[in-house]
């Protein structure tokens, strides 16, 4: 006990009343108003509690403190009086703060600040929206991915800050009258091929595709090593030359020199060089056949093989090269008599006649082009008188029916010996290489040396055998008529043709056989 009559054991936040009692300090309370034992405590009274009599007034908040409380203006408000705290509603001078005025950059870019009571909001500019994680920050709306599909399907959507554009896809262009960019843009495919906007190499043909184009090798060309076909950067080389090489097993310097020239012409070949290249090949062939050199020392069968190889290859090469010529009629002739007539046209519906010194060919233009082939139509005729040397004593193989008919008509008159070549050997070709069964026949008129009386005149074609050689044949060809120095032949296929005089002694006017190619 304190001698002065004050208890020393009073709990924290209390004061003694006398020597045996204590009372809680203002702002604190205990279970009973007078504390008589040290076990009791004084607890802080929360003046801000709901049932409290304290009222701070509007736009303010009550803050409880140890043994007391403070009134403060709510966030977004400030006291006009300048006093940070107050005790009751009568002292309250809180009013709204205009944050937008205080800090003009509050909404950063792309937003407008709007003051509200006690706060502010950011109103985003068109094309922007509030960021969910930071509601005061305006972020670009990506109209292209927002599922709004604002652009026409012929365009692609390009998002930009605060906006978007509808742009024509690569390889497309605005339809007439349409803009390129606004959301009402409508586009159409650009035909790069016909508009000349393509980058195709001259060795290729341009094909338009939706929104793009591709470059395909020209007919008779193949992609250069390691370069795929049908790409924008496809570059091709002519197959024409690579396949025309000396026949296997034939050893001739003269022939090798000819094929060396062909390969030289092919090495740096370009479509624009077609005319010069055709002339140079025929010049080389003309010289080869004028002076066959060691070819003449080869066995007959090998000579026939060489002739077969030359005829076959020449037809392929001329077909390939002539597709690169411009429209019109070409005639070339060479010192030893080789002659070429060529007509190149975009397909026309009429018959075509090619005239040469010793032969005339007539056929329908519509035979010339394979359907779906984009190139021009070509009809060509080559007369190769020099080929006769290599085809001397070449056999004639008749179809069994014709053979039988001849035996019946001229029994016992079939003589030994090969047929005699009366005319120049001619070779006919079209841009279409599928000429085994023409829908309308081709007619040839041959001028030739005189026919020995009572000998059989046959229109024949050179049939390339399986062995790479060949023989004269008459299948699909018929002789329309023959005079002393001319014969008309009609054929349902194309190849190399000639008029032969066969060793049959014709007893009377014979309706049988005469064939052409």
């Amino acid at each position: 006990q304190d001698s002065r009559g004050c208890a020393r054991w009073c709990p924290q936040d209390s004061s003694c009343v006398n020597a045996t009692a204590c009372r809680c300090n203002p702002g604190f309370s205990s279970f009973s108003e007078i504390i008589t034992t040290p076990m009791e405590t004084c607890d802080d009274i929360n003046e801000c509690a709901t049932l409290s009599k304290v009222s701070c007034g509007k736009f303010s908040d009550c803050w409880n403190t140890e043994g007391s409380y403070d009134c403060v203006c709510s966030p977004g408000y400030e006291p006009v009086s300048g006093a940070k705290t107050f005790k009751n509603e009568s002292e309250n001078t809180c009013q709204d703060v205009d944050e937008c005025q205080q800090n003009p950059r509050l909404c950063k870019s792309y937003g407008t600040c709007v003051n509200t009571l006690g706060s502010y909001t950011c109103q985003c500019l068109p094309g922007f929206k509030l960021k969910p994680e930071d509601p005061k920050l305006c972020t670009d709306v990506n109209e292209c991915t927002s599922g709004q599909n604002p652009c026409h399907s012929s365009t692609h959507c390009l998002n930009n800050v605060g906006s978007y554009q509808c742009r024509c896809r690569p390889g497309w262009q605005p339809i007439p009258g349409s803009p390129n960019g606004p959301n009402n843009t409508v586009c159409e495919d650009v035909d790069e091929c016909s508009s000349g906007q393509h980058q195709c190499d001259s060795s290729t043909v341009c094909f338009n595709t939706v929104g793009s184009y591709s470059c395909r090798c020209r007919p008779g060309w193949k992609p250069r090593h390691g370069i795929p076909n049908n790409q924008k950067d496809t570059v091709c080389e002519d197959m024409t030359f690579s396949t025309w090489t000396p026949p296997p097993g034939v050893h001739s310097q003269t022939l090798s020199r000819f094929f060396d020239k062909v390969q030289d012409l092919g090495r740096d070949y370009k479509p624009g060089l077609a005319n010069n290249t055709i002339q140079s090949i025929l010049q080389a062939l003309d010289e080869l056949l004028e002076a066959p050199g060691d070819l003449e020392t080869l066995p007959r069968l090998q000579q026939h093989c060489v002739a077969s190889h030359l005829l076959d290859g020449l037809e392929d090469v001329l077909r390939g090269l002539s597709k690169n010529l411009s429209n019109g009629l070409l005639n070339f002739s060479y010192p030893a008599g080789t002659e070429l007539s060529l007509e190149v046209q975009k397909q026309v519906d009429r018959s075509v006649t090619l005239r040469q010194n010793q032969a005339v060919m007539q056929l329908d233009w519509n035979q010339a082009q394979k359907s779906g082939d984009p190139g021009p139509s070509v009809v060509g005729l080559v007369s190769i008188p020099g080929m006769g040397k290599l085809l001397a004593e070449a056999p004639l193989v008749l179809e069994p029916e014709k053979q039988m008919l001849l035996h019946e008509t001229h029994q016992g008159l079939l003589q030994d010996g090969s047929p005699i070549l009366l005319s120049d050997v001619i070779s006919a070709f079209l841009s279409n290489n599928d000429t085994q069964n023409l829908s309308s026949p081709v007619t040839f008129t041959f001028s030739h040396r005189s026919v020995i009386p009572r000998q059989k005149v046959l229109c024949v074609f050179w049939e390339h055998g399986q062995n790479g050689c060949g023989h004269w044949a008459t299948t699909g060809c018929s002789t329309i008529g023959t005079r002393d120095t001319s014969t008309i032949c009609r054929c349902t296929h194309l190849s190399s043709f000639a008029v032969l005089m066969a060793h049959y002694d014709v007893q009377e006017e014979d309706p049988v056989l005469t064939v052409i190619t």
């Epitope: 190499d201 001259s202 060795s203 020199r257 060396d260 020239k261 390969q263 030289d264 012409l265 090495r267 740096d268 370009k270 479509p271 624009g272 060089l273 005319n275 010069n276 290249t277 140079s280 010049q283 080389a284």
Partner: antibody, heavy 118, light 106 residues
């Protein structure tokens, strides 16, 4: 008639570049390769390369790769040769000539003299 | 590359004399061409494809050969024939010229 008209003489400093032109007339520009030939004073003919005007394809001799750039403009039927990093040994007469494998070089320009001097 | 060796390098001939020069190739060549060049002028194509005379070339000139061996002949030398003659091939890249044969009038 076929003509190849070359640009006038050039005087250039070492390290500089010159672009020579060769204007073709009288024939279809894309039917032949355009050849470029160098001839130093008192020396023989030296092939530089060729350009095919139809597609801009070029052929070069190894020595002139990187030294001579060959181009052709179909619209004006003109072939060009740019010679770069000029040195004294580039002083020469440069000819353009129309060429085809089987015919050789049948028409020649009059030549352009290039002198490299500091 | 194909090297063309011309011989002789220099030769002289009197008017009326027959002149022959050769061009030897290090590999086989199928198209050989010859050019004439006079001092201060552009070369002129003289013979092409081994033996064909270019337009305007007198027929006293001729060419022959095959493979690796080619020759150029003037049947009867004339004063106007004095010039340098070059052979040329393009059978393989790069195109090459011979070093030339200088023909002088004796």
């Amino acid at each position: 008639q076929v003509q190849l008209q070359q640009s006038g003489a050039e005087l250039a400093r070492p390290g500089a570049s010159v672009k020579l032109s060769c204007k073709a007339s009288g024939y279809t520009f894309t039917n032949y390769w355009m050849q470029w030939i160098k001839q130093r004073p008192g020396q023989g003919l030296e092939w530089i390369g060729a350009v095919y005007p139809g597609d801009g394809d070029t052929r070069h001799t190894q020595k002139f790769k990187g030294k001579a750039t060959l181009t052709a403009d179909k619209s004006s039927s003109t072939a060009y040769m740019q010679v770069s990093s000029l040195a004294s040994e580039d002083s020469a007469v440069y000819y353009c000539a129309r060429g085809f494998t089987a015919y050789g070089m049948d028409y020649w320009g009059q030549g352009t003299s290039v002198t490299v001097s500091s | 590359q194909i090297v063309l060796t011309q011989s002789p390098a220099v030769m002289s001939a009197s008017p009326g004399e027959k002149v022959t020069m050769t061009c030897s190739a290090s590999s086989s060549v199928s198209y050989m061409h010859w050019y004439q060049q006079k001092s201060g002028t552009s070369p002129k194509r003289w013979i092409y494809d081994t033996s064909k005379l270019a337009s305007g070339v007198p027929n006293r000139f001729s060419g022959s050969g095959s493979g690796t061996s080619y020759s150029f002949t003037i049947r009867s030398m004339e004063a106007e024939d004095a010039a340098t003659y070059y052979c040329q091939q393009w059978s393989s890249n790069p195109l090459t010229f011979g070093a030339g044969t200088k023909l002088e009038l004796k």
